[in-house]
């Protein structure tokens, strides 16, 4: 270790024999008192009570007696003043100070940087008596020094109330560098320059920095800590790291890996999680982002129907939560989806395509052309249509729902019939006379029922009557048609 | 604006030595490496080696070890390279050039001829 | 050593054609500056670091590859252009430069 002597000055008279150096070895001490709590009480009983002491650093005792002659003023003697030790050495230093007999109690505590040492510190004080005075020495020892330790220590003690403050110790721990800036991975953009930075401290200080891109040393002359390194910019993923050199030695940052951001992978695992007949859901998995958080994503759905004309719908979602529902399908049919997701950097590549279905649905289309006529001599309705049109059936036709309204006089009533798919006609009876007959008609596939068509009124008149002309679903723009004779 | 200045052209003996000073200005002189490089007669570039100029520390390569030495002056911002036992196939322009991260050469000095003739 | 092997030696063009030298590499390297020297002249630093151009130099200079090929582009070249170019590696000590390429006007 490498110390710094101050010189010694007396501000005492101390008792014969060196002091405190190599102590004598007839000077055994009376009482070696080691610290528990860091807060060390040093006893001393005297029959004389002392007068108040002088405040501050240096105690001037005041005695009463005959003569009343004062003593000189009480100050811890000087000592090493800076010790300078390497990481994990031992360190011993002590405060040392001769006090009257005539004082009763003294306390000596150990103070680091303006606060007290309590705890586990290995700390003892020893006492050393004479006619006069008593010498006490407070040591202090660290077995393994760490950065922690570096810092000024002082001795304080209390004396009737009064306080003696020793000059500081400093300790100064040196060792390898350390670091207190390392450089950290990143995902940069090809060809595009970016910053690494480092930092390390000693002590010893200056704390130079070396770079070091895959293994090849970047600057050969170091740059003094901190030090800021522009990457001219990657092709391809490198591993950084820095190396802190200080008198002591070399220090070696972690290594970080620097990665190229990339367009994506395709998702992969595209899968149909439901269909209906004008909806499919799909969900996915995500390829490799590319270090590079993905953005959106894009569907891409084509009909797998050879006769098809080929055209691609392409819906955008966001690219949370791997799910899309596929909507404005035709039912019934048959379509390849293909999922692309992009990050700041572009698009990837389109996934496996995939086949899927739309179910039967519900028509689209009500059956058209639907006409009504009294046949009176039988006492029905005949009613006539034309099927909807097969793109638009959303399924195979199984019947057609039939709904008739009879109002008459504050009466109404509707009736339902079930017709098969086969027929474009049906007979009704006639409910009700002097009457009006309300008919609409509606496709029905496995999928559902379809919107009824445009209502068609036909009136019934009293028995007895003509037959009538048949009434018909109206051309566009005439409403609630009726036929009355 | 960054310079390195050279001496001049030097025509020396076999067997004699050469001093070339290399003055740079408008930057921090031990900041920056500096690096020697060869120029043969209608050759190309070949690079001598560096000094580090905060340590004062020499490098060389493999074919410049021996009776090549780099030099500094830091307090007039000053390389120096000096050759001894010239033999004729020392001849050649010799650069000085500043020498940064990443081993770029990016400021040049302005050459100097050693020309080694009996 | 890594050796740098530039192609064509040689090249001889005409004012506004694109020109492309190549620079390959006996083993891979980190990057590859490129240095112009006219003649009688020092070399001067062109592209540092693979692709990125150096202070005051024209945007019609361009370099790219990574690896052990790396190539140096005049995208239209202009009179002062005719010189002759330099490949040097960074990756493993010591540095070296490649044989050099002349372009000559055609």
């Known amino acids: 270790a490498i110390t710094e002597a101050r010189e010694e000055a007396k501000p005492y008279p101390l008792f014969p024999g060196p002091f405190p150096g190599s102590l004598q070895t007839d000077h055994t001490p009376l009482l070696s008192l080691p610290h528990a709590s860091g807060y060390q009480p040093a006893l001393m009983f005297s029959p004389t009570q002392p007068g108040r002491p002088h405040t501050g650093n240096v105690a001037i005792p005041q005695v009463t007696s005959v003569e009343s002659k004062p003593l000189p003023p009480l100050a811890f003697k000087h000592t090493v003043g800076h010790i300078i030790l390497s990481e994990h050495k031992g360190v011993k230093f002590n405060c040392s100070i001769s006090v009257p007999n005539i004082y009763q109690d003294t306390t000596i505590s150990w103070w680091k940087d303006g606060k007290e040492l309590l705890g586990a510190h290995h700390a003892i004080t020893q006492f050393y008596p004479d006619d006069e005075v008593t010498a006490i020495i407070a040591s202090f020892s660290i077995t393994s020094v760490q950065r922690s330790d570096n810092g000024s220590y002082i001795c304080k003690m209390k004396i009737n109330n009064e306080e003696i403050v020793s000059d500081p110790i400093y300790i100064e721990v040196q060792g390898l560098p350390h670091f207190t800036k390392q450089p950290e991975s990143m995902n940069v953009t090809r060809n595009t320059a970016f910053n690494l930075t480092c930092q390390a401290v000693g002590p010893p200080e200056p704390v130079n920095i070396f770079w070091v891109q895959n293994s090849s040393r970047v600057n050969e002359q170091p740059e003094k800590s901190p030090s800021v390194l522009t990457v001219p910019g990657l092709t391809e993923m490198a591993v950084f790291s820095c190396e802190a050199h200080n008198d002591k030695g070399l220090t070696v940052s972690k290594g970080v890996q620097i990665n190229i951001k990339a367009i994506p992978s395709p998702p992969t695992e595209v899968s149909i999680r439901n269909s209906t007949a004008h909806s499919i859901l799909i969900s996915w998995v995500p390829g490799f982002d590319g270090y590079s958080p993905f953005r959106n994503c894009s569907i891409q759905v084509k009909e797998a129907d050879p006769l098809s004309n080929g055209s691609v719908m392409i819906f955008n979602t966001s690219a949370l939560p791997h799910l899309y529902q596929i909507k404005q399908l035709q039912a019934l049919a048959n379509y390849s989806i293909g999922v692309s997701c992009m990050n700041e950097i572009g698009w990837s590549a389109v996934s496996p395509w995939i086949l899927a279905s739309t179910t039967e649905g519900a028509p689209s289309v009500a059956p058209l052309n639907v006409t009504v006529f009294l046949n009176e001599s039988s006492d029905n309705v005949d009613i006539r249509w034309m099927k909807p049109p097969t793109k638009q059936q959303d399924g195979e036709l199984v019947g057609y729902r039939i709904s008739h309204v009879w109002q008459s006089a504050g009466i109404s009533k509707e009736l339902l019939e079930e017709v098969g798919q086969n027929g474009s006609r049906a007979r009704i009876s006639v409910q009700v006379h002097n009457a009006t007959c309300t008919v609409r008609i509606a496709a029905v596939t496995r999928g559902g029922v379809g919107p009824f068509s445009d209502p068609v009124k036909i009136f019934i008149p009293a028995h007895g009557w003509v037959d009538y002309a048949p009434s018909s679903t109206p051309a566009p723009g005439n409403a609630d048609p009726v036929l009355i004779i | 604006q960054v310079q390195l200045v050279q001496s001049g052209s030097e025509l020396k003996k076999p067997g004699a030595s050469v001093k070339v000073s290399c003055k740079a200005s408008s930057y921090t002189f031990t900041t920056y490496g500096m690096s020697w490089v060869r120029q043969a007669p209608g050759q190309g570039l070949e690079w001598m080696g560096w000094?580090?100029?905060?340590?004062?520390?020499?490098t060389y390569t493999d074919d410049f070890k021996g009776r090549f030495v780099f030099s500094l002056d830091t307090s007039v911002s000053t390389a120096y390279l000096q050759i001894s036992s010239l033999k004729a196939e020392d001849t050649a322009v010799y650069y000085c050039?500043?020498?940064?991260?990443?081993?770029?050469?990016?400021?040049w000095g302005q050459g100097t001829l050693v020309t080694v003739s009996s | 050593d890594i050796q740098l092997t530039q192609s064509p030696s040689f090249l001889s063009a005409s004012v506004g054609d694109r020109v492309t030298i190549t620079c390959r590499a006996s083993?891979?390297?980190?990057?590859m500056h490129w240095y112009q020297q006219e003649p009688g002249k020092a070399p001067k630093l062109l592209i540092y670091a693979t692709s990125n151009l150096a202070q005051g130099v024209p945007s019609r200079f361009s370099g790219s590859g990574s690896g052990t090929e790396f190539t140096l582009t005049i995208s239209s070249l202009q009179p002062e252009d005719f010189a002759t170019y330099y490949c040097q590696q960074w990756g493993s000590l010591p540095f070296t430069f490649g044989q050099g390429t002349k372009l000559e006007i055609k």
């Open positions: 083993s891979s390297v980190g990057y």
């Open positions: 050039a500043r020498y940064t991260n990443y081993g770029v050469f990016d400021y």
């Open positions: 000094i580090n100029t905060a340590s004062g520390v020499p």
